[in-house]
Interface confidence: medium
């Protein structure tokens, strides 16, 4: 039975050219996290963090994506095209698979603030 909950940074905004941290946190379960996948809105994989193999950043994103902090992901040199949904997928044992959603809005404005408040989707 899946008892866990994915908490995410929810809806966040950041300014063009800047960076942003995407974070998901799995709580309320004793399940072991075997792998975390990070995907973009069009289902393309950005990065994978395997418990035993470590991080794999996909070639198309290697210049703009940094692993961490923790199981999170840092997007750098943001462009307007980065606006959209991001998903974290937690493969766990023995629970199965959990999925969280984050919406990132990239703003032209220099006053864009990065919100890091965790939300339950």
């Amino acid at each position: 039975m899946m008892t866990g909950t994915i908490e995410t940074t929810g809806n966040i905004s950041a300014k063009k050219g800047g960076s942003v941290i995407l974070q998901c946190h799995l709580s309320s379960t004793m399940a072991q996290v075997t792998q975390v996948n990070w995907e973009q809105h069009d289902h393309s994989l950005l990065a994978i963090r395997n418990a035993e193999l470590g991080w794999h950043i996909y070639p198309a994103f290697k210049d703009r994506v940094a692993p961490g902090p923790g199981l999170g992901l840092t997007l750098q040199s943001l462009t307007m095209n980065d606006t959209g949904e991001y998903f974290c997928t937690y493969h766990t044992y023995p629970d199965g698979t959990y999925r969280g959603r984050i919406f990132l809005e990239v703003l032209e404005s220099s006053v864009a603030e990065h919100s890091a408040r965790f939300q339950i989707p």
């Epitope: 792998q35 995907e39 289902h43 994978i48 418990a51 035993e52 193999l53 998903f87 044992y93 999925r99």
Partner: antibody, heavy 119, light 107 residues
């Protein structure tokens, strides 16, 4: 060249036990997750077990949970499947397979070993 | 457990034709799907993983696509060596079930 060679298949009575082995060569065995998959006489494929590269994580479907145990010896480049309390529905060709890095899909398969459970 | 409904169960086609095989998942599996080919008396071989990624060594006439919970394997300009059985498999949750298979036969 990647090679996976299964052995240990046999005719066994219901309730009996059997241990299958899979000898791996041609790749760094300790870097890959591994799986056992079986193919029933009616040609259906059934996933049986998965073990992570270091052996810390294992997954089983409900149909074999508590009866089958997957394990590995990275020093010997060998994958195992210990099967107990065997049932007639466990009759199948058993394949060991290597998983793609960071994905659960299986990119190399052995030739299979046959297990028949019958009285 | 997630069920994978594969269709058609069998298909009789001619060399040079284009074929599409589909698998429908009983719930969202978010592109966590693979396609395999199995020839008579042989082990399965990986064709596509993560729904759309062509496996190393798989011919470019094979392609995978997704529309919601329906996944498709397309074979362009069918070759004689493409005849055999095809299976999908999902990797979501904890029970990674296969579709029932599609047997591709020469017309």
């Amino acid at each position: 060249e990647v090679q996976l060679v299964e052995s240990g298949g046999d005719l066994v009575k219901p309730g009996g036990s059997l241990k299958l082995s899979c000898a791996a060569s041609g790749f760094t065995f300790s870097s890959y997750g591994m799986s056992w998959v079986r193919q029933t006489p009616d040609k259906r494929l059934e996933w049986v077990a998965i073990i992570s590269s270091g052996g810390n994580y294992t997954y089983y479907p409900d149909s074999v949970k508590g009866r089958f145990t997957i394990s590995r010896d990275n020093a010997k480049n060998t994958l195992y499947l210990q099967m107990s309390s065997l049932k007639s529905e466990d009759t199948a060709m058993y394949y060991c397979a290597r998983q793609i890095h960071y994905f659960f899909a299986m990119d190399y398969w052995g030739q299979g070993t046959s297990v028949t459970v019958s009285s | 457990d997630i069920q994978m409904t594969q269709s058609p169960a069998s298909l009789s086609v001619s060399v040079g034709e284009t074929v599409t095989i589909t698998c429908r998942a009983s719930e969202n599996i978010y592109s966590n799907l693979a396609w395999y080919q199995q020839k008579q008396g042989k082990s399965p071989q990986l064709l596509v993983y993560a729904a759309t990624n062509l496996a190393d060594g798989a011919p470019s006439r094979f392609s995978g696509s997704r529309s919601g919970t329906q996944y498709s394997l397309k074979i362009n300009s069918l070759q004689s060596e493409d005849f055999g059985s095809y299976y999908c498999q999902h990797f979501w949750g904890t029970a990674y079930t296969f579709g029932g298979g599609t047997k591709l036969e020469i017309k």
